[in-house]
């Protein structure tokens, strides 16, 4: 099946509010959402 | 409210360019892929062109494969589209279109109202 | 390139009636449980509109009259009961694989 990237930017955030409670650590944004076409062999530009 | 609004079309000779633009707001530009889609004058609708939301990914059908280039910039919330070597079947209203869906490439959710684009001689 | 054949390309339907527009794949468009074929209406000198996403999604903000179903390589849009607003032509799309590609579209005119 494919991944579900909104499902992927909710664990992301959810683990980066833990680092920075339980570690005092500090994860700087990333964006999930510059993703190739799920179901293309086609390469990017 | 969410609007997206194209610019930039116009009467051109066959073998010429072209440069489409596409206004974004009302949502994070940045976080969407984009495309161009056409509407001939039969009213038949065709994909142009996409491109994933930080630019990265281009895709064209091979119709226009070599001749369009999309092409975006997020800090000004505008898509572009680049059109050289114009066919008189490139003919058509061409529409600015968001890619919604939670794998951001499912199905246009917003639309402009288009740029109209005639290659005539 | 997968070809969606929509084989109507009018209809006629009293105010009030059921309207069925179909839509059909040259191959199946759904994949993991998820069929990747959407609806739109277009009235005249307007942009198209997102009816119905992913087989049988009502968008937000389109009427609950409106409703999609299908799989595979079969797909129906149903509106019902029909009201005067809905004289338009509706298209169907799939986005399982590039070249996205639209069908010709089917044109509703309420009687």
């Known amino acids: 099946g494919t991944i579900n990237v909104h499902d992927v930017e909710t664990q992301f955030n959810q683990y980066k509010t833990e680092a920075a409670s339980r570690y005092n650590l500090t994860i700087s944004d990333v964006s999930v959402s510059d993703v190739p076409f799920p179901f293309s062999a086609q390469s990017g530009a | 409210e969410v609007q997206l609004e194209e610019s930039g079309g116009g009467l051109v000779k066959p073998g010429g360019s072209l440069k489409l633009s596409c206004a974004a707001s009302g949502f994070t530009f940045s976080g969407y892929a984009m495309s161009w889609v056409r509407q001939t004058p039969e009213k038949r609708l065709e994909w142009v062109a996409t491109i994933s939301s930080g630019g990265t990914y281009i895709y064209y059908p091979d119709s226009v494969k070599g001749r369009f280039t999309i092409s975006r910039d997020n800090a000004k919330n505008t898509l572009y589209l680049q059109m050289s070597s114009l066919r008189s079947e490139d003919t058509a209203m061409y529409y600015c279109?968001?890619?919604?869906?939670?794998?951001?490439?499912?199905?246009?959710?917003?639309w402009g109202a288009g740029t109209t684009v005639t290659v005539s001689s | 390139d997968i070809v969606i054949t929509q084989s109507t390309a009018s209809l006629g339907v009293s105010l009030g009636q059921r309207a069925t527009i179909s839509c059909r794949a040259s191959k199946s468009v759904s994949t993991s449980g998820y069929s990747y074929m959407h609806w739109y209406q277009q009235r005249p000198g307007q942009p198209p509109k997102l009816l119905i996403y992913?087989?049988?999604n009502l968008e937000s903000g389109v009427p609950a009259r409106f409703s999609g179903s299908g799989s595979g390589t079969d797909f129906t849009l149903n509106i019902h009961p029909v009201e005067e607003e809905d004289a338009a032509t509706y298209y169907c799309?799939?986005?399982?694989?590039?070249?996205?590609?639209f069908g010709g579209g089917t044109k509703l005119e309420i009687k």
């Open positions: 799309q799939h986005s399982r694989e590039l070249p996205f590609t």
């Open positions: 992913l087989a049988s």
């Open positions: 279109a968001r890619l919604g869906g939670d794998n951001y490439y499912e199905y246009f959710d917003v």
